[in-house]
Interface confidence: medium
């Protein structure tokens, strides 16, 4: 099935900004929202954002979760508010590494 | 067995400098998150700093920010805290933490949480004229 | 940052007692992220409990936690004469991390 091509006039979307990209700012708008999590040095680093450009989301959303990163992307006014993305996890549960929100 | 060792402390005028040395043991020191924690005399815990396995990602408490710097050497097995422009109130214990960030086999994380399983004894740090 | 309020600041309990400490986070933090300690006059803090519920290994069954949300709780179902100390909850829900002010069990 051939992937969806973006309309000519795209609909933008009010996004949750959180993370170093954002500046001053507690929101974005832009195409796509985003919620992120990545381990950096032993780290949890949190990031919610927005695609400006369809092309910018269209292989980070599909991106399946790894163990080092995970991307949510949704579509819709403040859709990513209440999304936390979550790593695979595997087998018995250990201690996890330290969480940062980089705001 | 399982040990953290602070070093360093002492008695030091306002304005002045200390580094403070913990040294790990027991562990595979690399694999590890390290925390600074503080205790003034009489008071309660206070978070002061916390650094990365391979030290490149730190972060610090408000109260410290610009003045302390965490760093850490895997080779030697130790943590360090370099405390410049010292205040009567960064007198404190001093402890240095261990965060078990314990990871799968597979590479799979868990997540998130986390809080610090190994305490050294302390260093008192005085900061007096 | 997110306060966290420890009650009672201190209590005076007989060895056999159950005794219960509250602490309170100023917004909302996921169980995984409250943490109790213990120390002792003189010493490092012990860990107790992770993950707001989770006994750390090496920890008498007679300690516990509960909670969510805003609200949790450390028990001592009987108190032991070893038991005798400040205990500190710990939030890591978002750096930088914050700790309790302690509350100071002693002897009646």
């Known amino acids: 099935m051939e992937d969806e091509k973006p309309k000519v006039n795209p609909k933008l979307y009010m996004c949750v900004c959180e993370g170093l990209s954002c500046g001053n700012e507690d929101h974005c708008e832009g195409q796509q929202c985003f919620s992120s999590l990545s381990i950096n040095d032993g780290f949890h680093v949190y990031q919610k954002g927005c695609f400006q450009v369809y092309e910018q989301g269209k292989m980070t959303c599909k991106t399946p979760p790894s163990p080092g990163q995970a991307v949510e992307c949704c579509q819709g006014d403040w859709c990513n508010r209440n999304i936390t993305a979550q790593l695979p996890t595997k087998g018995k549960s250990f201690p996890g590494t330290q969480n940062f929100h980089l705001e | 067995e399982v040990q953290l060792l602070e070093s360093g402390g002492g008695l030091v005028q306002p304005g002045g400098s200390l580094r403070l040395s913990c040294a790990a043991s027991?562990?595979?020191?690399?694999?590890?998150?390290m925390h600074w924690v503080r205790q003034a005399p009489g008071k309660g815990l206070e978070w002061v700093s916390v650094?990365?396995?391979?030290?490149?990602?730190?972060y610090y408490a408000d109260s410290v920010k610009g003045r302390f710097t965490i760093s850490r050497d895997n080779s030697k097995n130790t943590l360090y805290l370099q405390m410049n422009s010292l205040r009567a109130e960064d007198t404190a214990v001093y402890y240095c933490?261990?965060?078990?960030?314990?990871?799968?086999?597979?590479?799979?994380?868990?997540?998130?949480?986390?809080?610090?399983?190994?305490w050294g004894q302390g260093t008192l740090v005085t900061v007096s004229s | 940052d997110i306060q966290m309020t420890q009650s009672p600041s201190s209590l005076s309990a007989s060895v056999g007692d159950r005794v219960t400490i509250t602490c309170r986070a100023s917004q909302g933090i996921s169980g995984n992220w409250l943490t109790w300690y213990q120390q002792k006059p003189g010493k490092a803090p012990k860990l107790l409990i992770y993950d707001a519920s989770n006994l750390q290994s090496g920890v008498p069954s007679r300690f516990s936690g509960s909670g969510s949300g805003t609200d949790f709780t450390l028990t001592i179902s009987s108190l032991q004469p070893e038991d005798f100390a400040t205990y500190y909850c710990?939030?890591?829900?978002?750096?930088?991390?914050?700790f309790g002010q302690g509350t100071k069990v002693e002897i009646k």
């Open positions: 650094i990365g396995y391979s030290g490149s990602s730190t």
């Open positions: 933490a261990r965060e078990p960030g314990y990871y799968y086999p597979s590479g799979y994380y868990r997540g998130p949480g986390y809080w610090m399983d190994v």
């Open positions: 710990h939030q890591s829900y978002r750096g930088p991390m914050t």
């Open positions: 027991g562990f595979t020191f690399g694999r590890f998150v």
